[in-house]
């Protein structure tokens, strides 16, 4: 029995609903009484949702899943996963048994955009050219882990003396803190770019130091 799922991962934003597509080709005369459908976590085989005995057996996954009952008889075995969480990320197997067995796995990639970075400077007063300063770029509640890039006002990448830490909160979302240590020139702009590699979304922050006072656009 051929079971079809998308090759590419399904990308879902945290808090939104995702559809994990799965389909099979029913034979003529097929009825739902002949269908056994199991959605399970691929790695652990934990049951997520099932259809058997001619009826929806319900969600075994925090009551956040649903089938499309009106479409099942046409071979649409897709699963709706509501209020996606970071912990949902992974591979889901669609197992179909009619008069034969078939299964296929679809990957769910969870994502959350990072907030616009906030920039802080230490020390933040009485700065002179030649002083060493620490610029911290902070961006919050994104997923998966971010890629962080620094550059100066001319667009030249700054890779030395950068320390980046990423901490997951209780929801699994990451807070990113990246610290750049630089020796000040006469004036300068320092930009931080926080990139979500799944969403290909960039969040920018910058600080411009022009003698006195400093500006934070």
């Amino acid at each position: 029995l051929e079971v079809q799922v998308p090759e590419d991962p399904v990308v879902a934003l945290v808090g939104t609903d995702a559809t994990l597509c799965c389909s099979f080709s029913p034979e003529p005369g097929f009825s739902l009484a002949q269908l056994n459908l199991i959605w399970q976590l691929t790695d652990t085989k934990q049951l997520v949702h099932s259809f058997a005995e001619g009826q929806d057996q319900g969600s075994a996954y925090a009551n956040r899943t649903a089938l499309f009952p009106d479409l099942l008889a046409q071979g649409n075995a897709s699963l709706r996963l509501q209020r996606v969480r970071v912990a949902d990320e992974g591979s889901f197997t669609c197992f179909v048994s009619i008069r034969d067995f078939g299964s296929a796995a679809v990957s769910l990639q969870v994502a959350a955009p990072y907030s616009k970075p906030s920039m802080t400077l230490e020390p933040n007063k009485d700065l002179r050219p030649g002083d060493t300063v620490t610029i911290t770029c902070s961006s919050y509640r994104g997923y998966p882990e971010a890629e962080v890039f620094w550059q100066d006002g001319q667009g030249v990448p700054l890779t030395g003396n950068v320390t980046t830490s990423q901490m997951a909160n209780e929801q699994g979302l990451f807070d990113v803190h990246s610290v750049l240590r630089v020796v000040l020139g006469a004036n300068g702009t320092y930009s931080c770019l926080v990139r979500n590699p799944v969403l290909q979304q960039d969040a920018h922050g910058s600080v411009t130091i022009t003698g006195q006072p400093m500006t934070f656009p």
Partner: antibody, heavy 120, light 108 residues
């Protein structure tokens, strides 16, 4: 009346072969998954093999894989189990059973069993 | 392979008493679990399928419960004909579909 009747059991030497049959009646044999289950003397039930409605999908327990072959002839309403390279541990009562549903499910009809003894 | 563990191995009870048999799976099997009864010299008989649905012709004193990994077969009031060996079996996703080791219900 829905009925399954096994035959073909007997005494065979280690390394020998035997072919079991299961004759079905009283239901649409060609619709259902069929299963072989065995029970060694004084022991519990062991799932051995299963075959789908048209014979295109066959499955085996690790203990018999490569030695046993399940097949069916829907025109004769008969299920078979070809057992080769028999070992002493294959000694058991062999039951055939039908799935309760057209997809693989619990087994709601069982035969009375046929005894296979592997001994020199 | 999923392993089903039944307990106790033997249950000694008197007619009229309540029997509670347990079946535990090594990993989830959802509700894809059946219970069978076997008497000496006879073939097994399907009692419960889908963890809790009684098969055709099975008396109401037999009931099944549970889902996931923990399942129970309850015989509310044992009759003389209920003394037998009981097996659980899963049929979750792909074969092989193992049986539990069995629980013997004997007369006390």
């Amino acid at each position: 009346e829905v009925q399954l009747l096994e035959s073909g059991g007997g005494l065979v030497q280690p390394g020998g072969s035997l072919r079991l049959s299961c004759a079905a009646s009283g239901f649409t044999f060609s619709d259902d998954w069929m299963t072989w289950v065995r029970q060694a003397p004084g022991k519990g039930l062991e799932w051995v093999s299963a075959i789908n409605w048209n014979g295109n999908s066959t499955h085996y327990a690790d203990s018999v894989k490569g030695r046993f072959t399940v097949s069916r002839d829907n025109s004769k309403n008969t299920l078979y189990l070809q057992m080769n390279s028999l070992r002493a541990e294959d000694t058991a009562v062999y039951y055939c059973a039908k799935s309760r549903t057209t997809y693989y499910s619990s087994m709601d009809v069982w035969g009375q069993g046929t005894t296979v003894t592997v001994s020199s | 392979e999923i392993v089903l563990t039944q307990s106790p191995g033997t249950l000694s009870l008197s007619p009229g008493e309540r029997a509670t048999l347990s079946c535990r799976a090594s990993q989830t099997v959802g509700s894809y679990l059946a219970w069978y009864q076997q008497k000496p010299g006879q073939a097994p008989r399907l009692l419960i399928y889908g963890a809790s649905s009684r098969a055709t012709g099975i008396p109401a004193r037999f009931s099944g419960s549970g889902s996931g990994t923990d399942f129970t077969l309850t015989i509310s009031s044992l009759q003389s004909e209920d003394f037998a060996v009981y097996y659980c079996q899963h049929y979750y996703d792909w074969p092989p579909y193992s049986f539990g080791g069995g629980t013997k219900v004997e007369i006390k």
